[in-house]
């Protein structure tokens, strides 16, 4: 389609005459406000179709949209249409008139809408106001469409100034139908019960006045109906509750319980389901693995945690070396068992600033009248290594010895290293590791002892140096899982008179 002039926006003089032409490969027609105004249609020798719309004695009321579309009963593939918007600035026309339908805007949800107040002159400044207020609202204006935005359930007017007079539009009314969607919540006093105990479920709806409840449950499927009770919890907003109560539950009552709520006015519905388990007798089950050997670091706090499932709620006891533990008044031990869901529990033993004496055999026992479970582990207290002694001696044999003694838990490893260039070591030159069996110039002898009372290992290592011809820095490093410690000593040759 080809439109002359092409637009898409034209500003024409009042009282003037103007010609619009549209041409295309099939019959074309001009449309204005869903009507076909009088126009001249023609077909050229080259097969081109055209339509000429002559606008005479233009007034502000001619302001608006004009469309050129194909007018072909053969139904061309294309839905092509060309839009042109014409302004005819006319001081005698304030706002363009609206149909009644355009003055009342009806909504069921929060969505962007347009308040279609339009003027004849694109240069005019137009503002939007609540009908009862003078303050202009910060809403974007399009001269071809009006004010677009999200509007509250109020009445609005548009204002503009033409010359020196202020002009008001008709009032526009926004009606929002507050359709309260149904929101159902279902909960049970307990989702796990033993046979013979009661099942009680509640289905609650908020904000609706007239609703219908329908329950489905395992007993219903076998034809054994239970009559629910419905009550109002609060007046505003409406809280309506349906209670389904099944006394003396049986194993067959296990399954899905569904509450379906409908309200007929707007045909809304919602449903929620909950699973109920009826067990023959109570249970206690450990969840997850706890290693049989646990570690704690000396003087640090350590929490040991056991997770388990149980119904009904169990009694939990902790033991150390078969003696019952309790919260100590000095705050050195803290015991807690908390319910993290209806049937899941976490029991924690916290040792504050761990001492060596707290190493030992620990047991947690959870039990009730139907079942019990216990879990045991050995607690090892890890002690960072300390080098307690590093000494050098000159036995008569002529060799020189360096003795290193240290303690820690778990057993420390010992690393000997030496540095020959005292000026550059250890910053520039890495120390040489000693004690490798292939080297003849040094020999290593290491003894390890476990001290039961202190519950730690002692390492004593002796390094024998065959011939020391210049001063040597010898370093002893002890390392274990929780730390390391180093000491060094300068070893000088026999020939030097000083130490």
């Amino acid at each position: 389609l080809v439109v002359t002039p092409p637009g898409p926006e034209l500003v024409l003089n009042v009282s003037s005459t103007f010609v619009l032409t549209c041409s295309g490969s099939a019959p074309v027609v001009w449309e204005r406000m869903s009507q076909e105004p009088p126009q001249e249609m023609a077909k050229a020798q080259d097969g081109t179709f055209s339509s000429v719309l002559t606008l005479t004695n233009l007034t502000g009321l001619d302001t608006g949209e004009y469309f050129c579309t194909h007018n072909d009963s053969r139904g061309l593939e294309t839905d092509e249409r060309k839009r042109l918007y014409i302004f005819v600035p006319d001081p005698t026309v304030g706002f363009l008139p609206n149909d009644a339908e355009e003055l009342f805007i009806f909504l069921t949800e929060i969505t962007e809408i347009t308040i279609p107040c339009r003027v004849t002159d694109p240069q005019l400044v137009v503002t939007l106001h609540e009908k009862k207020g003078d303050v202009a609202l910060p809403v974007p204006y399009d001269h071809q469409r009006g004010f677009s935005g999200i509007f509250e359930d109020r009445s609005y007017i548009c204002k503009t100034t033409i010359g020196d007079r202020e002009v008001d539009s008709d009032a526009y009314y926004v009606y929002r139908l507050q359709v309260s969607s149904i929101n159902v919540s279902v909960n049970a006093v307990q989702t796990v019960v033993r046979q013979g105990e009661n099942i009680t479920l509640m289905c609650i709806v908020i904000g609706n006045e007239v609703v219908n409840f329908e329950w489905t449950y395992p007993r219903k499927e076998s034809g054994r109906l239970v009559e629910p009770v419905t009550d109002f919890l609060l007046d505003m907003p409406y809280h309506i509750r349906s209670i389904l109560h099944i006394p003396s539950a049986e194993l067959e009552d296990s399954g899905t319980y569904t509450c379906n709520v409908t309200e007929s006015v707007n045909d809304h519905q919602d449903e929620k389901a909950i699973n109920i388990t009826v067990v023959e007798s109570g249970y206690v089950r450990l969840l997850g693995e706890v290693g049989t050997l646990q570690f704690a670091e000396l003087h640090r706090s350590r929490t040991l945690q056991v997770v388990f499932e149980a119904y009904p709620p169990p009694t939990v006891l902790w033991f150390k070396d078969n003696r019952t533990l309790g919260d100590s008044s000095a705050g050195e031990i803290a015991l807690s068992t908390r319910n993290v869901s209806e049937t899941r529990y976490v029991s924690e033993l916290t040792l504050v600033r761990v001492k060596v004496a707290e190493a030992g055999h620990y047991t947690m026992r959870a039990f009730h009248e139907d079942a019990e479970v216990q879990l045991s582990f050995q607690l090892q207290i890890n002690v960072p290594v300390r080098v307690l002694e590093l000494s050098e001696s000159h036995p008569d044999s002529g060799e020189q010895t360096v003795r290193c003694r240290g303690r820690g838990m778990p057993q420390p490893n010992i690393i000997w290293s030496a540095c020959r260039d005292l000026k550059r070591c250890p910053r520039e030159l890495p120390p040489t590791l000693l004690g490798n069996s292939s080297e003849e110039e040094s020999q290593l002898e290491t003894n390890v002892t476990y001290w039961e009372e202190e519950q730690e290992f002692e390492v004593v290592s002796t390094l024998r140096l065959q011939h020391v011809d210049r001063p040597l820095s010898v370093r002893c490093t002890l390392r274990n899982a929780v730390g390391q410690d180093t000491q060094e000593v300068i070893v000088v040759p026999h020939s030097l008179p000083f130490k």
């Epitope: 009806f106 009862k132 359930d153 109020r154 009314y173 926004v174 009606y175 139908l177």
Partner: nanobody, 116 residues
Framework: QVQLVQSGAEVKKPGASVKVSCRAS????????MQWVRQVPGQRLEWVGL????????VYAPKLQGRVTMTTDTATGTFYMELFSLRSDDTAVYYC?????????WGQGTLVTVSS
């Protein structure tokens, strides 16, 4: 507080007519139109028409012109909307609504079902 209470659901055969009432209480009868709107399930609200409180001024949606009439009983404060020559596509929930300037007020809706 304005309250609008509508008549109950109706089931009609094609070609019949239906008259829906809307009783208004707490309503200032002089300053606001009573609107009638309908909603086919799953579709947008469609304007049906309006009448003024005294019942001497009505405007109908062009689509329904000639098939709809709106009247008012000022003594009881009841508005009526009557739709004639019912068709299956007239099946909808019909609402009356009015505007207080700072908010709108709605009836609870009346379901009209047209079915042979």
């Amino acid at each position: 507080q304005v309250q609008l209470v509508q008549s109950g659901a109706e089931v009609k055969k094609p070609g019949a007519s239906v008259k829906v009432s809307c009783r208004a209480s707490g309503y200032t009868f002089t300053n606001s139109f009573m609107q009638w709107v309908r909603q086919v399930p799953g579709q947008r609200l469609e304007w049906v028409g309006l009448s003024n409180p005294s019942g001497d001024y009505t405007v109908y949606a062009p689509k329904l012109q000639g098939r709809v009439t709106m009247t008012t009983d000022t003594a009881t404060g009841t508005f009526y909307m009557e739709l004639f020559s019912l068709r299956s596509d007239d099946t909808a929930v019909y609402y009356c609504a009015t505007h207080g300037g700072d908010r709108s007020y709605w009836g609870q809706g009346t379901l009209v079902t047209v079915s042979s």
